[in-house]
């Protein structure tokens, strides 16, 4: 007989998730309405396509990227979809409450859905560090806390540091990475005897993870350009992101081979490193004046990513209990920092070039912005980690980590747990 959810979780999850969904429906009923204005239909279609690209990145890209575990691939993909669906709903409301609410109702536009999808993406990046060690009820908590923390961070940053939509959203890489790592740090770490094989990657799930990486690779330019407000900015962002990810692919594959004693290529390195350039140019993608700079950034990002994948997993596994194949967290944390540093360098060059004073003050503001993003990520991540450790959620036993059978019905399996 196939395994069942523990009784308590069977009671807890549907009740918790459906009550939450009912609450969201009520909030939408009382506080939202659609944008009633007449749209230019061509513009509407173009705007929808950007949102569609982001949804593909989230549902297929990040969904499959995290599916490389031997016995946890179903859960990775489906839990990602569940978190995305829930995260988008809450993010739309939260963004509306934080930015529009004083005027009455929250107006829902394609742009607000775009923003919400990007906010929900944050959770999908973070969750890579904890997938396999938590159940759906715990993931609901993680979605709510992280989306709320990111929404508030974006509002605080836009108000205090006066940054536009693009800039305050591009902290998502650093925020999501540090949030995920701090949640992982709070969860039970040691993998008990007999479960080591479960966090290993298998060929078919690894292939689906590569498929996820390919989708992300294709659509990363859309993500980096989605919130820019002019065609020339979007064009620069698309071009620079494309050049950066193209170079990071070449670097990832050749660097992975270089890092192996027999010159073999590691699937895990490649899954993650192909995206390195996109993360590194994210913040400054619209400011980089020529392709060669974006390409150099892609090269450096690819090398950092491969280097990180080679040397950091041991440390992360010991300290945070993150399996070797879940390298998105520390990868994004390093590459996000690289991207922020590049932005500050470009800002200094631009300020010097314009002959304006206050360079030191500008740099201080940028560093303050980055520091605030990291601090809020760590604090909210620790809070989430502590919440997830509460007995109420009936977390999977360590022996059931990285196991689809705990959550899914497999009629063809005779042996249960």
């Amino acid at each position: 007989m196939s395994s069942k959810y523990p009784r308590s979780v069977r009671r807890c999850l549907p009740l918790w998730a459906l009550t939450l969904e009912a609450a969201l429906i009520l909030l939408f009923y009382f506080f939202t309405h659609y944008d009633a204005s007449l749209e230019d239909q061509k513009g509407l279609v173009a705007s929808y396509q950007v949102g569609q690209d982001l949804t593909v990145m989230a549902a297929i890209g990040l969904g499959f990227l995290t599916s490389s575990f031997r016995r946890h691939s179903w859960s990775s993909v489906a839990f990602n979809l569940f978190m995305l669906a829930l995260g988008v709903q809450w993010a739309i409301l939260l963004d509306g409450f934080l930015s529009q609410f004083p005027s009455g109702k929250v107006v829902i536009t394609l742009f607000s859905i775009r923003l919400a999808t990007m906010s929900a993406l944050s959770v999908l990046i973070s969750v890579d560090a904890v997938l396999g060690k938590v159940n759906l009820a715990q993931l609901v908590v993680m979605v709510l806390v992280e989306v709320t923390a990111l929404g508030n961070l974006r509002m605080v940053i836009s108000n205090i540091f006066n940054t536009d939509y693009h800039m305050n959203m591009m902290h998502i890489y650093v925020f999501a990475a540090y949030f995920g790592l701090s949640v992982a740090w709070c969860l039970p770490k040691p993998l008990p005897e007999g479960t080591e094989d479960k966090d290993q990657t298998a060929t078919i799930p690894s292939l689906s993870a590569m498929l996820g990486a390919l989708f992300l690779w294709m659509f990363w330019p859309s993500f980096n350009s989605a919130l820019l407000r002019s065609p020339i900015e979007r064009k620069n962002a698309v071009f620079n992101t494309y050049y950066a990810v193209a170079v990071s692919v070449v670097t990832a594959i050749s660097g992975s081979s270089l890092a192996h004693p027999q010159g073999k290529i590691s699937k895990t390195y490649v899954h993650s490193a192909v995206l390195a350039g996109g993360v590194a140019v994210g913040t400054s993608c619209h400011l980089i004046p020529s392709p060669w700079l974006a390409m150099v950034l892609g090269l450096v990002a690819g090398l950092i990513s491969v280097g990180g994948a080679k040397y950091l997993p041991g440390c992360c596994n010991r300290v945070l209990g993150i399996p070797h194949s879940s390298i998105m967290g520390y990868n994004f944390s390093l590459l996000g920092l690289l991207g922020e540093i590049i932005y500050i360098v470009l800002l200094v060059l631009d300020t010097v070039g314009a002959g304006n004073g206050m360079i030191g003050f500008q740099v201080l503001l940028s560093i303050g912005e980055l520091s605030l993003a990291i601090v809020i990520a760590l604090m909210s991540g620790l809070l989430t980690g502590l919440l997830l450790n509460l007995k109420i959620w009936k977390a999977p036993h360590e022996a059931k980590y990285f196991d689809d059978q705990v959550f899914w019905k497999f009629p063809h399996l005779a042996v249960g747990f």
Partner: antibody
Framework: QVQLVESGGGVVQPGRSLRLSCAAS????????MHWVRQAPGKGLEWVAV????????DYADSVKGRFTISRDNSKKTLYLQMNSLRAEDTAVYYC??????????????WGQGTLVTVSS | QTVVTQEPSLTVSPGGTVTLTCASS?????????PNWFQQKPGQAPRALIY???KKHSWTPARFSGSLLGGKAALTLSGVQPEDEAEYYC???????????FGGGTKLTVL
């Protein structure tokens, strides 16, 4: 050369609606964000609303939020401002302006000559 | 509610130099507020002069220059001409949405 021509102004009673238009020529309209700015008689300029180049996002000043709607038709090279629930304090000359947004550059570049809206009973 | 403050009026002699400033109630003005300056003469539409702190439009005379001074945006006119007598407005962009807020305007008189 760049030309912006506002129309649709006039005298209207409080609580009624009015729709302003801004016809653009001499540049690629669909590549530019557009703004409405107003100026009450004898007073300073007040920013009203912005719409992005593709119409995907719009934002408003608090004083008009929920009452005014900015929209555009790129195929007609026209910008609109739908004004509902008009008040006496909405009396002003309304200007449309193009937005330059590139990297770390932001500007209201070209302005129309304006159209006068008078809200009076 | 954000307030942008300018000097209500300034007087300058022809050929002289004058600096108009623009302060924000939120604190120091930086290049991230993209300060813009406009000139408006009676009965005319505003005309853009300076954008993004110090950049000039193709039609902006060389005697106009923009900068940041002590946490404020500044517009400096060197070698003032009689035709520079006008109202000058600054515009700052705020927050994620980059909403515009104009200053109250400075009436420049050339005596």
């Amino acid at each position: 050369q760049v030309q912006l021509v506002e129309s649709g102004g006039g005298v209207v009673q409080p609580g009624r609606s009015l729709r302003l238009s801004c016809a653009a020529s001499g540049f690629t309209f669909s590549n530019y964000g557009m703004h409405w700015v107003r100026q009450a008689p004898g007073k300073g300029l007040e920013w009203v609303a912005v719409i992005w180049f593709d119409g995907s996002n719009r934002d408003y000043a608090d004083s008009v939020k929920g009452r005014f709607t900015i929209s555009r038709d790129n195929s007609k090279k026209t910008l609109y401002l739908q004004m509902n629930s008009l008040r006496a304090e909405d009396t002003a000359v309304y200007y449309c302006a193009t937005e330059l947004a590139r990297g770390r550059l932001r500007a209201l570049e070209y302005w129309g000559q304006g159209t006068l809206v008078t809200v009076s009973s | 509610q954000t307030v942008v403050t300018q000097e209500p009026s300034l007087t300058v002699s022809p050929g002289g130099t004058v600096t108009l400033t623009c302060a924000s109630s939120t604190g120091a003005v930086t290049t991230g507020y993209y300060p813009n300056w406009f000139q408006q003469k009676p009965g005319q539409a505003p005309r853009a002069l300076i954008y993004s702190t110090s950049k000039k439009h193709s039609w902006t005379p060389a005697r106009f220059s923009g900068s940041l001074l002590g946490g404020k945006a500044a517009l400096t006119l060197s070698g003032v001409q009689p035709e520079d007598e006008a109202e000058y407005y600054c515009l700052l962009f705020y927050g994620g949405a980059q909403l515009g807020v104009f200053g109250g305007g400075t009436k420049l008189t050339v005596l």
